[in-house]
Interface confidence: low
Amino acid sequence: MMTGTIETTGNISAEKGGSIILQCHLSSTTAQVTQVNWEQQDQLLAICNADLGWHISPSFKDRVAPGPGLGLTLQSLTVNDTGEYFCIYHTYPDGTYTGRIFLEVLESSVAEHGARFQIP
């Protein structure tokens, strides 16, 4: 039975040209995290594997930084970065947990962070 929950940074916004940290946190489970995938729509951005460490997709190597923790830092944001991001936790023995973050990249300097929310 999957008892865990994923807490994410929820709906967030950031300025064009700036940077943002995407973070998820898995709680309420004793399952071992073997790998975390970060995906944008259906595109793989990065992997953090418990044994192998971080791998950033070649498309994003110049502007995606691993961390902090299992999170991901997006740099030099453009309006094209607006959209859904998913953290996919592969765990043993529970299986897969998925969290969703919606990022809006704004032209203006007004970029307020949305509240945290949980995805069961």
Epitope: Q41, Q43, L44, I47, G53, H55, P58, S59, K61
Partner: antibody
Amino acid sequence: EVQLVQSGAEVKKPGESLKISCKGSGYSFTNYWIGWVRQMPGKGLEWMGIINPVNSRTIYSPSFQGQVTISVDKSVTTAYLQWSSLKASDTAMYYCARYYYYAMEVWGRGTLVTVSS
Amino acid sequence: LPVLTQPPSASGTPGQRVTISCSGSSSNIGSNTVNWYQQLPGTAPKLLIYRNNQRPSGVPDRFSGSTSGTSASLAISGLQSEDEADYYCEAWDDSLNGPVFGGGTKLTVL
């Protein structure tokens, strides 16, 4: 089982066009870049370029930029390598490979291309 | 010319330990991990070592990799006749934004 199945050997004349294929199976095709590598007879491995199956973004080696075109059709989980006008110097074995952690971890068996008049 | 430099040949007798070197620069081996490939005669290359020293499942622990600065090396201990093959080092190059190979080392088991 993860596999990259390449199209068969080709014999062409100089100036002809050619498109060879590499079909991925047994895994989520869009989660891995596909690369192409050339090996001329008796020589070493040369990286030609890679493609992201999600959005067809390509990165070419400067040596092959403008000489070949790499493309993908994710609906049939297949990557392609094509020439518009072959030269005798294109005679080689061409391999496709799947990337994971910046390593070419799964390879096709190769397609032998022979260009001769 | 290959961006990474390997000796063209190496040899050893069965049971011996053989090391193959691979020299690069700050934009490749100096800042990225190294992979090694084995190409047996008449076959496609096969990943032997990735991320400097990791072995894919099925690769014997006789094969090991290491790096130091802008150089890498592949060590094969307890050499066997079936190890006779071409060995290539490879690393991502930040200036090229793509991978670069060594010229390959032909290993002969005497």
